[in-house]
Every structure is written in structure tokens, then in C-alpha cells.
């Protein structure tokens, strides 16, 4: 689940089994000139960044929950 910083896709691989408990924020990057795929990068409670699989049902649920909590704040 390493995260690269160059101007290309940042997610080299994604983590399986992610749990929402330690997720502080989620950044959804839409496809663009530097990366043809959607990327989901979570920032964990300890500051570590983790790439998530945007196609995973649980990740979709986590993103939806985070976006809803952002709207209500």
C-alpha cells in the first residue's frame, strides 16, 4: 500500500481488509493526465497514508460515510 509522490499514479498497491476505525480522512483522486485510474488515499490515525481499492464495497461505504460526516460538520 505504498504511496508514491511523483507526478504519476500514487498508489502502487492497495490494502485489503481496511477498517474505518483508524481512518482520519480520505482523499479521492479522480483520473487525470498523470494517472488513468481513480485513487483513494486514506490518512490513518498515526499519520500513515494507505491506498485503498476504490472498487471495494467496504471502501465505497467508508468514502460515503466520510463524505456524509464532512457535510454534517
Amino acid at each position: 500500500a505504498s504511496v508514491a509522490t511523483e507526478l504519476r499514479c500514487q498508489c502502487l498497491q492497495t490494502l485489503q481488509g481496511i477498517h474505518p476505525k483508524n481512518i482520519q480522512s480520505v482523499n479521492v483522486k479522480s483520473p487525470g493526465p498523470h494517472c488513468a485510474q481513480t485513487e483513494v488515499i486514506a490518512t490513518l490515525k498515526n499519520g500513515r497514508k494507505a491506498c485503498l481499492n476504490p472498487a471495494s464495497p467496504i471502501v465505497k461505504k467508508i468514502i460515503e460515510k466520510m463524505l456524509n460526516s464532512d457535510k454534517s460538520n
Epitope: I18, H19, K21, N22, A42, L44, K45, G47, K61
Partner: antibody, heavy 119, light 107 residues
């Protein structure tokens, strides 16, 4: 490599308190939740609670609230569990277990600390 | 709190055989179930998390499946070192809760 070293066995009197420790090494202690689990003789595992050493955030099972306190000392990478007003029901082996950051699986466990409450 | 009902509480199987343990949650746990192997005098060992993901170093003889409220854990080609008590753990919602355990013995 990750290691969790727990303190030795305790024989304590009913009504007294005990504080057991779990010294972590091989990882960034402050960055991972530490869980505590109880096993009474001949019984199964029971989750007690957890502490996040980085900010001292805690979560407890309802059954354990009021029975004790979880603390952590970042300078020595040691987690503690204090149990108060001990009764025979508290006689058990207590385990500490690190919780992985992204998937919260308890991937590393201490060897256990036996607490015997007897007069 | 979520209750985890684990069965059977004990089972006996032959070397080389297969065993299956089940856990039923009192509500949907979104695949957040782990399975642990526990031997006397040692700390429990994580075998599987998130229903089916094998912990590194665990042989592929171990497997897990399930969704919603119903989950199972299997060991095939049983070996002597598999003798232990196995526990399921739900970690969908705090407080985390364990199943009652299954003591595995070899015939």
C-alpha cells in the same frame, strides 16, 4: 521484530489492586492501539479494552468499566493495566495485543500475565 | 454488544482430515472477523483476518469464508501441531467480542 513482553505472575489479596505491564519493542509504540484480553481458568477469551499511546485515547468493554484503568508510558514503550477491588473473578491470565493500524487485526500478542486473587 | 456464537465447543478429527468451525454473529459484521489459534501457556496467534485473509507464515491449509452474520473456518490436511483452541473475534463494532472457542483434538 515486534515483541510484547509482559510482567510476571502476581498473587494478590482480595480487595487490593494490581498493575501489570506490557513492554513493546520493534515498532513505533505510540502509533498503534494496544489491546488487553482476559482468560479465566478453563474459560475463553474476553476483550477488556484498548489504549492508543499516542494520545491516550481509550475504549473499554462495558463489563470492565470501573474495574480498572489502561495507561501507557511512551518514554518506556510500556502499556499498563491496573485492576482495582480485586475478587476471585479477577483471577485470570491477562494478555496484551497490538492492533495493526489499517485493518485493526491483533497481530502480535504478549505471553500473558497470570493474576491469582487469594487470601 | 455483538454476540458471537461459536460451534462446536470441541471436536475430534483424524490426522490428514478436515475440520470446520462456525461463528454466527448477532448482527451483520461486514466480514470483520478474525480467527486465532491458542495453545496453552502461549499468547493467541492470528491465523486469518477480514474473513479470509491469511496471516503471513500461516499455511494455506487454513481458510475462512463467510459474510453477513455467518462465518466459517476450516483446516484441511490436519497436522499434530494444529491441536489448539480456536477462537473467532468480531471487530466490526466496539467492544470487540470473541466466540466461546473450539477445542480441537486429534483422534
Amino acid at each position: 521484530q515486534v515483541q510484547l513482553q509482559q510482567s510476571g505472575a502476581e498473587l494478590v489479596r482480595p480487595g487490593s489492586s494490581v498493575k501489570i505491564s506490557c513492554k513493546a519493542s520493534g515498532y513505533a509504540f505510540s502509533d498503534y492501539w494496544m489491546n488487553w484480553v482476559k482468560q479465566r481458568p478453563g474459560q475463553g477469551l474476553e476483550w477488556i479494552g484498548q489504549i492508543y499511546p499516542g494520545d491516550a485515547d481509550t475504549n473499554y468493554s462495558g463489563k470492565f468499566k470501573g474495574k480498572g484503568t489502561l495507561t501507557a508510558d511512551k518514554s518506556s514503550s510500556t502499556a499498563y493495566m491496573q485492576l482495582n477491588s480485586l475478587t476471585s473473578e479477577d483471577s485470570a491470565v491477562y494478555f496484551c495485543a497490538r492492533e495493526r493500524d489499517y485493518d485493526v487485526a491483533m497481530d502480535y500478542w504478549g505471553q500473558g500475565t497470570s493474576v491469582t486473587v487469594s487470601s | 454488544d455483538i454476540q458471537m456464537t461459536q460451534s462446536p465447543s470441541s471436536l475430534s478429527a483424524s490426522l490428514g482430515g478436515k475440520v470446520t468451525i462456525t461463528c454466527k454473529a448477532s448482527q451483520d459484521i461486514n466480514k470483520y472477523i478474525a480467527w486465532f489459534q491458542h495453545k496453552p501457556g502461549k499468547g493467541p496467534r492470528l491465523v486469518i483476518h477480514y474473513t479470509s485473509i491469511l496471516q503471513p507464515g500461516i499455511p494455506s491449509r487454513f481458510s475462512g469464508v463467510g459474510s453477513g452474520r455467518d462465518y466459517s473456518f476450516s483446516i484441511r490436511n490436519l497436522e499434530p501441531e494444529d491441536i489448539a483452541t480456536y477462537y473467532c473475534l468480531q471487530y466490526d463494532n466496539l467492544p470487540w467480542t470473541f466466540g466461546g472457542g473450539t477445542k480441537l483434538e486429534i483422534k
